[in-house]
């Protein structure tokens, strides 16, 4: 954990953003020539990402520590947060430039304009998250992470506008999980499925994570979840923690929060 610009940071990063994703050969890392990298992307219905597309993805949290081919024979990789083992301590696109030898072997950065996007890093004061394809049914085998990161001192008010996920007793198939932290390890609030609208949730700090997962079968209508930034309140007007959870929702697995 650390502070930068009044915002919490840690090392949870997106594997896909703004239509851009990383691919390597079946046999492992750094095995693709430029022509093969191009073929990999085209077989999946996309093409090699341009430098601009990779940078746009990086800006919303796309971070991969592996050099890959881009359009026009360029090689590089996107770094969101500098680290000792990757990116030479820099952020941005670590750019190896346009390669003269197109037979060099790297990974690939693909761009697929048709991909149903989900997830991202959000710093706006308000936003609505939708399941991929909403209002149409979401697809199988989806994993999406929405990381909310507001100004230090602000809190997050989360409300469920629409909610319809495959229902099962333990929410083991399709579910939304909420975390009162910037990752999906700490601060577990709850896991939700079914079609009952969960109660509003208010964070304890300036960060929150939503995770959506769907399994390999049975889909449903999906969801819309809204958040709004709550500005800090003065100490004199602060009461007890206003974080709420629903005791009435049978499709809710309670986390560490007390029920109010």
């Amino acid at each position: 954990w650390g502070f930068k610009d009044g915002i919490f940071h840690n090392s949870i990063w997106l594997e896909r953003a703004a239509g851009v994703y990383h691919r390597e050969a079946r046999s492992g890392k750094y095995k693709l020539t430029y022509a093969e990298a191009k073929a990999v992307c085209e077989f999946e219905g996309g093409h090699l990402a341009t430098y601009k597309q990779l940078e746009a993805a990086r800006k919303i949290g796309f971070h991969v520590c592996a050099a890959g081919w881009m359009a026009k024979g360029r090689v590089g990789y996107p770094i969101v947060k500098p680290g000792p083992n990757c990116g030479f301590g820099k952020t941005g696109i670590i750019d190896y430039g346009i390669r003269l030898n197109r037979s060099e072997r790297w990974d690939a950065y693909c761009y697929n304009p048709h991909a149903k996007e989900c997830g991202g890093v959000f710093t706006d004061p308000k936003q609505i998250f939708k399941s991929p394809g909403f209002p149409n049914e979401y697809e199988d085998n989806q994993i999406c992470y929405w990381h909310i990161r507001l100004k230090y001192g602000q809190r997050i008010h989360l409300s469920f506008l629409d909610f319809d996920l495959e229902d099962d007793p333990g929410c083991l198939a399709d579910y939304v999980e909420i975390y009162d932290s910037y990752d999906d390890v700490h601060g577990f609030v709850g896991r939700y499925c079914g079609d009952e609208l969960p109660d509003d949730i208010i964070s304890t700090g300036n960060v929150m994570t939503l995770k959506f997962l769907s399994d390999a079968s049975v889909t449903a209508g999906g969801f819309q979840i809204k958040y709004v930034a709550m500005d800090p309140v003065s100490k004199s007007s602060q009461g007890k923690n206003t974080s709420t959870t629903s005791t009435g929702n049978k499709n809710f697995l309670a986390g560490r929060f007390s029920h109010l």
Epitope: A25, R26, K31, E36, A39, V40, E44, D140
Partner: antibody
Amino acid sequence: QVQLQQSGAELAKPGASVRLSCQASGYTFTTYWMHWVKQRPRQGLEWIGYIIPSSGYSKCHQKFKDKATLTADKSSNTASMQLSSLTYEDSAVYYCARSTSGYPYYFDYWGQGTTLTVSS
Amino acid sequence: ENVLTQSPAIMSASPGEKVTMTCSATSSVSYMHWYQQKSSTSPKLWIYDTSKLASGVPGRFSGSGSGNSYSLTISSMEAEDVATYYCFQGSWYPLTFGAGTKLELK
């Protein structure tokens, strides 16, 4: 165990359309790609195209672009191929074959084949 | 289109004999794969990624090659090896098969 069960033999008239199906079992349907391969009597194998069930994206060999339409139904784990405007040259055995999504591709499991006979 | 040329088209071998068939590609590929097909049955994956034997394939089979030239070898021919063998490339669109080498028993 992995199985690809194809629909039964078809007899169709020239100009008609036919839909062949391939039901997958024993693995997660959406994590692999499904390809279709044609084999005319006493001849070699010819790749038709593939579908990525997770996204629905499909692509056919240019030669089959106006002939074959590939679809996948995730709820029934079934891939299908519709062949249109049938001619005698479409008489063949058609196989579905699974490939990994990892490049470069190869087919690790095949269906038993569907025999299509086009005859007036 | 990456055309795969297999040779010979037909060959016969006596039991115990060493057998080699080749596959040449018009464009370089990183791996070649091989399928075995016996009459009236579906093809079976036989060798993948140039030299890896598929599950259940006897150890007398081997594959080698790189770039544009690949081969399948049987160290000691057996009666059950009678079949047609197809090479296949999955690197370039469109995916392509060779025309096959038919292996018979002498």
